[in-house]
């Protein structure tokens, strides 16, 4: 039978009471019921109490008494009592409500927005409510729009309702702006502000925040979350369509997040319990705002049981290159539910082996690939709860770009020099995966560029590939290759033997494999000068003679050759340039700069230095020669000649040692006749000794020597006696 409406203790549709009083309101009904209260009352915990009791004849009725102590203006609103668990179609018949005004002379408006206006969204042509409801129905309220408009209720388009505020039946652009409700109570003006924003129909984005496609095991619960993002002024309707929609399988929850200052986020969450095969298919979330529409869908797959299939993505043997920032080793996996993934390297857990190994989904990422990363990689896949396990192994080869060992260990800032005509052994040791091949090339120096680096100036010139029979450049004795173990690695050593070093240039060894190519330039500069830099003094000059110095440098290693004089002044060495230097002479392998100072005096003594700049390092190199000009001194004999006797046919030596500056010239006389060198008479070094072989009677006589230089001369004489007779026939 039809239930009689619940009955409230206060009769009529509305009731006015003063703020600060206590509100007592009883609801009596034929079934259990609940209260629906204004928002601010529901939040009250201490002021509000609800007491339930049995009442009426025989206690057969249900009573509920609501008590609100010290009621306040913002408690104004609808208080309703309704039966529990009544079909929604009969809702109207099973609810009783009353609107209670809680009057406060100091607070005419229920909601006061005296400083910052409350934003109201409006759509042109639709109803717009300016919700400045009041705490007493007798309060007169005026609606104003900044700057000067007053919106007057006409009972049609604009209606005043003390329970709601101003109702504008079809809003226009004229209502967009800053609106103020004003009320004067006891001579005091009260204002509450509202700002209308035009409602838009923009949908920024719609997403289903679950992986696509969605996979589920039969009997499990499906939860799909649809999110719509809109500007602040947009409201949306969200609906779902799905395979078993006719049976209303899904429950949908909605909520809105307005915490973001730039956008509204609307959520619609679809849930289906105990998924069956009939629930698989396309699930679509549709979002509408006025004429705007957006939708997003996802496929839902249902599986009867857990499974794993795994295959190689490409081939079983994979290749990468050492030095790569990142390499992804991945397998083609189909599985449900998601299996646990463990990667092994050579049988051991990869991620424990190195921090450079990271698991991402079904892939193993190797960061900063090195040669040591080569090996066998196994993916272990397991769905433990279903006892499903699979594994698959792939082999990774890490290729290495060739490296030339000598290039790494070489610390020479500038090239080595190779003595002219020498035999030289040049070696390049290369490492790489796969094993690199080594080829030799010859790059001749351009001899026109006498003052430039060979490896700079010859860019445009061709390089020639070499073999043992090549006739380019220097004669090659052999080119050989052998394997060498260096630092525990198998390296390829290639040796080029130059038989006869004659031509300057650059030998280039190139090591190549499929990863790349690397080259080493060996500057092969021939030198005809020891160490590539040599200073020569013809002889130490005496006062009045010429000083002759020469400086020879390797032309590929040095430039800017000049002679300077070093003088020490106040403990500081000063460099003085020497004027009137001759032009340098450039030859095939070297540059020579001669310095001649004519007719030297004692003041020309000092440290002479040849200065040249190293082409490679830019460093200035000095080679010094200490020159001491000697004062002239008349000759003097260290020992006078003395008479002596010699046997016929024997030999004899006469010594005439003299000193003087410059070194004296020695002249020999016999019986006042100048002696010339002839068979049997030999003049020793500097003519200071006279050697007579097989003495004869004719050799007897007076011998004298004369030592002469620019300062004078000195003489000494002696008589040579020959003893015994000669056998003339023998001499014939």
């Amino acid at each position: 039978s039809k239930l009689k409406d619940p009955e409230l203790s206060l009769k009529g549709t509305q009731h006015i009471m003063q703020a600060g009083q206590t509100l007592h309101l009883q609801c009596r009904g034929e079934a259990a019921h609940k209260w629906s209260l204004p928002e601010m009352v529901s939040k009250e915990s201490e002021r509000l109490s609800i007491t339930k009791s049995a009442c009426g004849r025989n206690g057969k009725q249900f009573c509920s008494t609501l008590t609100l102590n010290t009621a306040q203006a913002n408690h104004t609103g609808f208080y309703s009592c309704k039966y529990l668990a009544v079909p929604t179609s009969k809702k109207k018949e099973t609810e009783s409500a009353i609107y209670i005004f809680i009057s406060d002379t100091g607070r005419p408006f229920v909601e006061m927005y005296s400083e910052i206006p409350e934003i109201i969204h409006m759509t042109e042509g639709r109803e717009l409510v300016i919700p400045c409801r009041v705490t007493s129905p007798n309060i007169t309220v005026t609606l104003k729009k900044f700057p000067l408009d007053t919106l007057i209720p006409d009972g049609k388009r604009i209606i005043w309702d003390s329970r709601k505020g101003f109702i504008i039946s079809n809003a226009t652009y004229k209502e967009i702006g800053l609106l103020t409700c004003e009320a004067t109570v006891n001579g005091h003006l009260y204002k509450t502000n509202y700002l209308t924003h035009r409602q838009t129909n923009t949908i920024i984005d719609v997403q289903i925040s679950t992986p696509r496609p969605v996979k589920l095991l039969r009997g499990h619960t499906l939860v799909l979350n649809c999110t719509a993002t809109t500007p602040l002024n947009t409201r949306v309707q969200m609906t779902w369509s799905y395979p078993d929609e006719k049976n209303k399988r899904a429950s949908v929850r909605r909520r809105i997040d307005q915490s973001n200052s730039h956008a509204n986020i609307f959520y619609s969450v679809l849930t289906i319990d105990k998924m069956q095969n009939k629930d698989k298919g396309l699930y679509t979330c549709r979002v509408r705002s006025g004429p705007s529409f957006k939708s997003v869908n996802t496929s839902v797959h249902i599986y009867d049981k857990a499974f794993i299939t795994v295959k190689h993505r490409k081939q079983q043997v994979l290749e990468t290159v050492a030095g790569k920032r990142s390499y992804r080793l991945s397998m083609k996996v189909k599985a449900f539910p998601s299996p646990e993934v463990v990667w092994l390297k050579d049988g051991l857990p990869a991620t424990e082996k190195s921090a450079r190994y990271l698991t991402r989904g079904y892939s193993l990422i190797i960061k900063d690939v090195t040669e040591e990363d080569a090996g066998n990689y196994t993916i272990l896949l397991s769905i433990k709860q279903s006892n499903v396990f699979k594994n698959l192994t792939a082999t990774l080869i890490v290729n290495v770009k060739p490296q030339i060992y000598e290039k790494a260990v070489s610390s020479f800032p500038d090239p080595a020099l190779y003595p002219l005509g020498s035999r030289q052994i040049l070696t390049c040791t290369a490492y790489g995966i796969p094993q690199p091949t080594i080829k030799w090339f010859w790059h001749p120096c351009n001899h026109n560029h006498s003052e430039a680096r060979c490896d700079f100036c010859s860019n445009n010139e061709e390089s020639f590939i070499l073999d043992a029979d090549s006739n380019m450049g220097n004669r090659i004795e052999s080119i050989t290759q052998r394997m060498a173990i260096i630092e525990g690695k198998n390296k390829m050593a290639s040796t080029l033997v130059v038989a006869d070093s004659r031509i300057s240039g650059i030998y280039i060894c190139i090591a190549s494999n499929k990863v790349g190519t690397v080259g080493r330039n060996i500057s092969f500069y021939i030198t005809d000068v020891p160490n590539g830099f040599h200073v020569n003094l013809e002889k130490m000059p005496t006062e009045g003679e010429d000083l002759k110095l020469s400086c020879t440098v390797n032309k590929f290693l040095y430039r800017d050759v000049t002679w300077i004089l070093l003088r020490t002044v106040n403990n500081r060495t000063m460099h003085y340039s020497i004027s009137k230097q001759k032009m340098a002479i450039t030859k095939e392998h070297s540059i020579t700069l001669n310095l001649t100072i004519m007719n030297v005096s004692l003041q020309d003594s000092g440290t002479y230095a040849c200065r040249a700049r190293n082409v490679y390092t830019g460093e200035e190199i000095l080679q010094k020669k200490e020159i001491t000009i000697r004062d002239q001194e008349a000759p003097y004999l260290l020992r006078n000649l003395s008479d002596h006797t010699v046997a016929i046919s024997s030999s004899t030596t006469l010594d005439c040692h003299a000193n003087g500056v410059p070194e004296p010239q020695i002249t020999w006389f016999k019986n006042n006749h100048k002696i010339q060198q002839e068979p049997g008479i030999i003049l020793g070094p500097g003519s200071s000794t006279l050697f007579i072989e097989r003495v004869t009677e004719e050799d007897e006589g007076v011998y004298h020597c004369k030592a002469t230089n620019q300062k004078g001369s000195v003489e000494s004489s002696a008589y040579l006696t020959v003893q015994g007779t000669s056998d003339k026939s023998n001499l014939e």
Partner: nanobody
Amino acid sequence: EVQLVESGGGLVQPGGSLRLSCAASGFTFSSYAMSWVRQAPGKELEWVSGINSGGDRTVNADSVKGRFTVSRDNAKNTLYLQMNSLKPEDTALYYCAKSIPPTDDRNYWGQGTQVTVSS
């Protein structure tokens, strides 16, 4: 004597930015909500932005939402309006005024600063 002095207006290209300032004196600035109001040539006054006395709550008219930001520095008695992504229709004389909505007493309004948005 109450004084509100606006500054910072000028000529700017569409898409550009300007920052208006309003220096207040002669009343307890920190006790009042403040407004920015504008008047385009030949049009009526339009309320643009407002900020509460503490400076922690702001609100903008629909026409400038997301582009203009109102702020205040109570220690300096100054109100600001940061205007970004300016459009030709933002061309107007901009006033700062006491309260929301602005008081009818024009003594509590500034003299205005001109903003022109044009290429």
